[in-house]
Amino acid sequence: LQDLCSNCPAGTFCDNNRSQICSPCPPNSFSSAGGQRTCDICRQCKGVFKTRKECSSTSNAECDCISGYHCLGAECSMCEQDCKQGQELTKKGCKDCCFGTFNDQKRGICRPWTNCSLDGKSVLVNGTKERDVVCGPSPADLSPGASSATPPAPAREPGHSPQ
């Protein structure tokens, strides 16, 4: 009997009520692997979620978030409100980044400006709530008579903020 069920392909289930015949998954359900005894109910993308891919008999629906929200987690398990650049999402909503921090995305947290002096460099362009500082040559490199053989270091590429 087990062998009969293992013959049932994805998109069907092994129907015990019908002598283990392979029956198609009912509407709004799916089975992504063969040999299933039941079909899973399709996920519905409603409210803040919108449908990216419709459910089929062999695969679950895939959701996205509506405009103004972004996906978090695997397969968009959650939607989180977007904020403006220069802000972060707190329990009380979107709040401006504190002085000395920035966020160049619509999501994630405000991060501290790069401390140029740690790399022996000087601040070339001041930071803002939306942008990190740009570090330039060290103060010694800018003094008269200093060698200019080495070009200034490029601005640091900010990493992605954590989800």
């Epitope: 996920r43 409603k46 409210g47 803040v48 959701c63 509506i66 978090l72 987690g73 695997a74 397969e75 968009c76 398990s77 959650m78 939607c79 989180e80 409100q81 999402l89 329990k91 909503g93």
Partner: antibody, heavy 120, light 107 residues
């Protein structure tokens, strides 16, 4: 301070429906998400579904699709959970809970719970 | 759905003990995990989110760690108020799911 206050205990017959309310105060009701989580006697917690009131349409765990309806009334800052075709296994404490960041997400504020007993 | 398995299911300890509870996910959930404390007849209370971030107002004796499939909640020095049931919750995959709970009781 955010508060979620739920309606009182209910005793229902198998096959009937129950509607539980959850009134929110102390926060911006429309933009936060309200979920419903149930806990059968001596059991763990189970997410049923939830709603962000400004969007008006709920999302449900697949297990409860077709049997649960979650709504929200922005004018009274109240969320509702209606469960139909009740059976004895639906005997549980039903909680409403708020998530403030991602939805459904983590729950930082909870109602006090509503006990629903399904018995013939 | 992702299964969350907590161990032990019951833990007997004394005030001042260091207590560790483990939560295992049936597949990787990155760091999308929370811990809740629940006392009899009360609603759960959020302690830890994102696996290791302490919720505002929660005592620093509570800490969380782990990522992927294995997570721990540690109470560095158990207090009388900490005797309760603790649940883990994953939000990485839809629908979110909870562990079955770990009851911390007085030895």
């Amino acid at each position: 301070q955010v508060q979620l206050v739920q309606s009182g205990a209910e005793v229902k017959k198998p096959g009937s429906s129950v509607k539980v309310s959850c009134k929110a105060s102390g926060g911006t009701f429309s933009s936060y998400a309200i979920s419903w989580v149930r806990q059968a006697p001596g059991q763990g917690l189970e997410w049923m579904g939830g709603i962000i009131p400004i969007f008006g349409t709920a999302n449900y765990a697949q297990k409860f699709q077709g049997r649960v309806t979650i709504t929200a009334d922005k004018s009274t800052s109240t969320a509702y959970m209606e469960l139909s075709s009740l059976r004895s296994e639906d005997t549980a404490v039903y909680y409403c809970a708020r998530s403030s960041g991602a939805y459904p997400g983590y729950f930082d504020y909870w109602g006090q719970g509503t006990t629903v007993t399904v018995s013939s | 759905d992702i299964q969350m398995t907590q161990s032990p299911s019951t833990l007997s300890a004394s005030v001042g003990d260091r207590v560790t509870i483990t939560c295992r996910a049936s597949q990787s959930i990155s760091s999308w995990l929370a811990w809740y404390q629940q006392k009899p007849g009360k609603a759960p209370k959020l302690l830890i989110y994102d696996a290791s971030s302490l919720e505002s107002g929660v005592p620093s004796r509570f800490s969380g760690s782990g990522s992927g499939t294995e997570f721990t909640l540690t109470i560095s020095s158990l207090q009388p108020d900490d005797f309760a049931t603790y649940y883990c919750q994953q939000v990485n995959s839809y629908p979110q799911t909870f562990g079955q709970g770990t009851k911390v009781e007085i030895k």
